[in-house]
């Protein structure tokens, strides 16, 4: 019974990627249950804590140090066998982050994509990383790994994601590792939200008092739909940032958000999208574009919105 029924399954919650100082729960699943188990680290480093100890249901590891990084296996309790223990489990690699300077993460052609498209996530650094790892927030599977390509003092790797579907939307981070310490990863890159559009019906976008306004006049853009969207997102052509607001149910059974743009200074083309709280990174089709024109003395810029969203944060819930 070796390797099949007799082989336990070792997993990590919430993830195999653990920040330095963080905690992770290792679970050894054996014979349709969580029994007593023993834990082993393959390189034999940092194991005094496991020596001769039997754990029940799960092992909580932490606060982790770089020495915790490595490959683990477990053996499940098997009282009536010769040794009293099962065959070794699958190998589980624990990666510890926060050991080198963070790399940068970029999306080509951009982070806002239509369903079915492919996006290239490029991770790069001036640290000579041997490998790059790409990880999606909330996923317990191992991160994708690529060998770094070195050019002109920069190491980088291009991760191809696609064809895009809702399950691939979310917040991505990348990490680097140096030779000889493959599981001791860098600090995470800044988070990058990959948003998939085109999954639901488009909302409508209108301007009050109208799409053509006098300079200095207050403008509000209203995004609405019969669909019960939880959040509306407003984007302006040529701007990286989007604004988002909670949808409000109206008496006419539509769901609407009103974006106050403040005193008009110059025009622009706007679009809005709807999304649901459960899938904050999956958006509707774009509304028809709305061109806002400003007459009178044009100024160089529209005032900053009162709550500009950051490069990331789109995929967080709006409380």
């Amino acid at each position: 019974l070796m390797g099949g029924q007799d082989k336990p399954f070792l997993s990590a919650r919430p993830s195999t990627v653990v920040p330095r100082g963080g905690h992770v729960a290792l679970q050894c699943h054996y014979r349709r249950g969580f029994n007593n188990f023993m834990l082993y680290k393959e390189d034999r480093s940092h194991v005094p804590i496991f020596h001769g100890r039997i754990f029940q249901e799960s092992f909580i590891m932490g606060p982790v140090t770089p020495a915790h990084a490595g490959t683990y296996r477990c053996r499940g309790s098997r009282p009536h066998s010769l040794t009293g223990w099962s065959a070794p489990s699958n190998p589980l690699v624990i990666m510890v982050t926060g050991n080198h300077r963070k790399p940068s993460l970029l999306a080509h052609p951009g982070p806002l994509l239509k369903s079915g498209e492919t996006v290239i996530l490029q991770c790069w650094s001036d640290v000579m990383f041997e490998h790059f790892f790409l990880h999606r927030e909330g996923i317990s599977e191992d991160p994708s790994r690529l060998v770094g390509q070195i050019h002109d003092g920069v190491s980088k790797a291009n991760f191809s994601i696609g064809p895009l579907m809702p399950v691939l939307a979310g917040t991505y981070r990348c990490y680097g590792s140096v030779p000889h310490s493959p599981y001791q990863l860098s600090a995470p890159s800044d988070p990058l939200d990959i948003v998939i559009t085109g999954l639901y019906e488009k909302p409508s976008l209108s301007a009050q008092p109208g799409p053509t306004v006098q300079a200095g006049e207050n403008v509000t853009l209203s995004c609405s739909s019969w669909s019960s969207y939880d959040i509306y997102h407003l984007s302006r052509e040529g701007e990286a940032h989007e604004r988002r607001l909670r949808a409000v149910p109206k008496v006419n059974r539509t769901f609407q958000a009103d974006f106050p743009l403040g005193p008009a200074t110059h025009g622009g083309t706007y679009r809005c999208f709807g999304s649901f709280r459960a899938l904050p990174c999956v958006w509707s089709n774009s509304s028809d574009p709305l061109l806002v024109s400003v007459t009178g003395n044009p100024s160089s810029s529209w005032p900053s919105p009162t709550e500009p969203s950051s490069k990331s944060g789109i995929c967080r819930h709006l409380h």
Epitope: H23, Q27, P48, I49, E57, F59, I60, M61, G62, P63
Partner: antibody, heavy 118, light 107 residues
């Protein structure tokens, strides 16, 4: 940031019970455990035991088996310590601290003073 | 149970002094030693774990070393805010046990 907030001081009579709560925030509650430590007036630190917040399995130091019970309410990220049949020698400050199977207690609650007096 | 014996139990130092506390385990604890600082009227705070790993936000004047049964905590340049009781703890095997503490006072 990680915070552990404990319930307020308790004055109890011998033989009574007390339940101390420890509400965690700033991390995923079920990825760590909760250790419990007590400190008698003017004394050092004494480990009571801990509960694995992922599996719910408790472990008690030998001297604390029986009257001391750990529990969890993961829906509100809270751990509890219940002490029954209180004795005068249970008078102490009780601390909760985040920690797991490796026994390192990296964040501590502010402590709950339990006074047992007739 | 593993017994942790701390010395000295009391230490008086001047600001800027280098001070060292020692902790002796009754058996080999394989570098599984942590150090905590407890200021008057406060809860303990983790300083060091696994003998020498500094916890997040702990100033680098605090360092730990040791192996086998003998461990030390060093403050390279004592500051007025370091007035506290310092406890060692073995996290090698349950029950986790603490030393009796070293009380640090500033002259």
């Amino acid at each position: 940031q990680i915070q552990l907030v404990q319930s307020g001081s308790e004055l109890k009579k011998p033989g009574a019970s007390v339940k101390v709560s420890c509400k965690a925030s700033g991390y995923t509650f079920t990825t760590a455990g909760m250790q419990w430590v007590r400190q008698a007036p003017g004394q050092g630190l004494e480990w009571i035991g801990w509960i694995n917040s992922h599996s719910g399995v408790p472990k008690y130091a030998e001297d604390f088996k029986g009257r001391f019970v750990f529990s969890l309410d993961t829906s509100v990220s809270t751990a509890y310590l219940q002490i029954s049949s209180l004795k005068a020698e249970d008078t102490a400050v009780y601390f909760c601290a985040r920690g797991g199977d490796e026994g390192v207690m990296d964040y501590w609650g502010q402590g709950t003073t339990v006074t047992v007096s007739s | 149970d593993i017994v942790m014996t701390q010395s000295p139990s009391f230490l008086s130092a001047s600001v800027g002094d280098r001070v060292t506390f020692t902790c002796k385990a009754s058996q080999d604890v394989s570098t599984a030693v942590a150090w905590y600082q407890q200021k008057p009227g406060q809860s303990p705070k983790l300083l060091i774990y696994w003998t020498s790993t500094r916890h997040t936000g702990v100033p680098d004047r605090f360092s730990g070393s040791g192996s086998g049964t003998d461990y030390t905590l060093t403050i390279s340049s004592v500051q007025a805010e370091d007035v506290a009781v310092y406890y060692c703890q073995q996290h090698y095997s349950t029950p986790w046990t603490f030393g009796g503490g070293t009380k640090v006072e500033i002259k």
